[in-house]
């Protein structure tokens, strides 16, 4: 049928709560295109009737709520004037208990996120809520170890939980809960987050300087291999850690299963006044999901990012 196939990473989701996935393919969906969702290679498109439990909402597929039988491969077909792309998304639905629901704890959780707070700093956690405009998201509540979070150090601001003066006790299991309203009906969204604490790097004031990257984008073709160096200068006696992170998680942990994106071995060159450190990130194969995501190089308290973007089409 002339459509180019693109495979996205698996999404693992919890039953009994809303879920939505947006069909975006940056070089195409910005223009005049039509988007149609299908399930398991069916020839019949997903319904566009908003009363349907599963329906297409503009470029999104929306589940209100997700159910056991919804596991499978979904395709969204993006048709432009001269192009056709079929994006495959593998959704796996499972039952997850964060607290013992029989004793009045929180209900089932969606896929756990891993997030990091920095010891001794003001930092924040994010409640990831990705839904179309037709879904109105209500007040967010945050829980730690099944208890609602209260106290001077914590502030719920939009989708974030601001944490001031992070301490070792802040590690643990968190959850954020939001009420989603769609066509007059209310649903509960609950995301679990495993929080670890990282030491504030360095003693007494050496602030590493990240020479490269410089908070910029890099044009790279889909499917290619890419290696990006993070170059850092720091004092000779520093104790700062240098690493690459994505979504607030070490890339080696985030891509633990596929090993598609890895952090390299750190090297350094010694100068009289300072050291120059290099640690690279390797993309064995650039995938669609990598575009638009900030890949952060951390060096002590310093950070800098790269964002991958598709090259502009060459119309020559």
């Amino acid at each position: 049928d002339g459509c180019k196939d693109i495979f996205m990473k698996n999404e693992i989701l919890s039953a009994s709560q809303p879920f939505a996935f947006n069909c975006t393919f940056p070089p195409i969906t910005s223009g005049e295109v039509s988007v149609t969702w299908y399930k398991n290679s069916s020839k019949i498109p997903v319904s566009k009737i908003i009363q349907s439990r599963i329906h297409q909402d503009e470029t999104w597929i929306l589940f209100l709520p997700m159910e056991w039988g919804d596991s499978g491969v979904y395709q969204c077909v993006i048709k432009g004037r001269d192009s056709c792309h079929r994006i495959h998304v593998n959704l796996t639905v499972f039952e997850k208990h964060w607290c013992d629901t029989s004793i009045g704890g929180l209900p089932n959780l969606s896929d756990e996120y891993k997030q990091i707070l920095h010891l001794g700093k003001d930092d924040s956690l994010t409640c990831h809520l990705h839904f179309p405009k037709s879904c109105v998201l209500g007040p967010i509540k945050w829980y730690k170890d099944c208890n609602e979070i209260k106290g001077e150090r914590f502030t719920v601001l939009e989708t974030r939980l601001l944490v001031s003066n992070v301490s070792a006790e802040d590690r643990g299991n968190y959850a954020c809960q939001a009420i989603l309203t769609h066509s007059g009906k209310q649903y509960e969204v609950l995301n679990g987050i495993t929080v670890s604490i990282t030491e504030r790097a360095g003693y007494g004031g050496s602030v590493p300087k990240i020479i490269y990257p410089k908070n910029h984008s890099i044009e790279v073709q889909l499917g290619t291999t890419l290696i990006v160096d993070c170059n850092v200068t720091d004092t000779k006696d520093n104790t700062n850690l240098r690493c690459w992170r994505v979504n607030n998680t070490l890339v080696d942990d985030y891509y633990d299963e596929s090993k598609r994106i890895r952090e390299g071995v750190e090297t350094h060159v010694s100068f009289r006044e300072h050291n120059l450190y290099t640690v690279n990130i390797t993309f064995l194969e650039v995938k669609m999901e990598d575009y638009g995501l900030p890949f952060m190089c951390h060096a002590g308290v310093s950070t800098a990012y790269i964002i991958l973007q598709l090259p502009a089409p060459d119309f020559r």
Partner: antibody
Framework: QVQLVQSGAEVKKPGASVKVSCKAS????????MNWVRQAPRQGLEWMGM????????RLNQKFKDRVTMTRDTSTSTVYMELSSLRSEDTAVYYC?????????????WGQGTLVTVSS | DIVMTQTPLSLSVTPGQPASISCRSS???????????FYWYLQKPGQPPQLLIY???NLASGVPDRFSGSGSGTDFTLKISRVEAEDVGVYYC?????????FGGGTKVEIK
């Protein structure tokens, strides 16, 4: 539609206190932070703090922590900001402001402003 | 506290011409969640401020599409593609990455 209506202008002596009210309508009052921002004559904007009507949690700019008290009356959907130990540099227009939504930040809704003049 | 620095202090523009205002933050406003917690406001004479742009590049409701926002984690630009008479006022940048929320000093835009 969302509306924030503030109390009228005040003239106060140095050392006195002023209490400015902000009456909210058109949304669920207890779902949103109410922010207070002030603007001295021909000056920029300065965030003073925010108050959550559901639980009376207050987050203040450290600059105002000893002088500002925020309270609410849920029966009338009104938030109050009291500034004590007034000095001449507190002469400003005081605004209450609410975010765009519970998910998206930025102050999309503002009161009309209350001019507080501190003069001996 | 995060310091927001705006340039220029004032700007005189011919109607129909483009205009550009810059703002720099003392700390990157790009969160690890990929959201940039940066905002633009316009305060017209005698009025409270109005939100123009949220999260660096999103147009607020009711704002004409001649306004656009862009930037990196620390350097931001507000562009007006064709300035109109109603665009006069003081433009402020702001951050809400962390408390206290802070504003830039403002850029006054007037019509030539």
């Amino acid at each position: 539609q969302v509306q924030l209506v503030q109390s009228g202008a005040e003239v106060k002596k140095p050392g006195a206190s002023v209490k400015v009210s902000c009456k909210a309508s058109g949304y669920t009052f207890t779902n949103y932070w109410m922010n207070w921002v002030r603007q001295a004559p021909r000056q920029g904007l300065e965030w003073m703090g925010m108050f959550h009507p559901s639980n009376a949690v207050t987050r203040l700019n450290q600059k105002f922590k000893d002088r500002v008290t925020m309270t609410r009356d849920t029966s009338t959907s009104t938030v109050y900001m009291e500034l004590s130990s007034l000095r001449s540099e507190d002469t400003a227009v005081y605004y209450c402001a609410r975010t765009t939504s519970m998910i998206i930040g930025g102050f999309a809704y503002w009161g009309q402003g209350t001019l507080v003049t501190v003069s001996s | 506290d995060i310091v927001m620095t705006q340039t220029p202090l004032s700007l005189s523009v011919t109607p129909g011409q483009p205009a550009s205002i810059s703002c720099r933050s003392s700390k990157s406003l790009l969160h690890s969640n990929a959201i940039t917690y940066f905002y633009w406001y316009l305060q017209k004479p005698g009025q409270p401020p109005q939100l123009l742009i949220y999260q660096m590049s999103n147009l607020a409701s009711g704002v004409p599409d001649r306004f656009s926002g862009s930037g990196s984690g620390t350097d931001f630009t507000l562009k007006i593609s064709r300035v109109e008479a109603e665009d006069v006022g003081v433009y402020y940048c702001a951050q809400n990455l962390e408390l206290p929320l802070t504003f830039g000093g403002g850029t006054k835009v007037e019509i030539k």
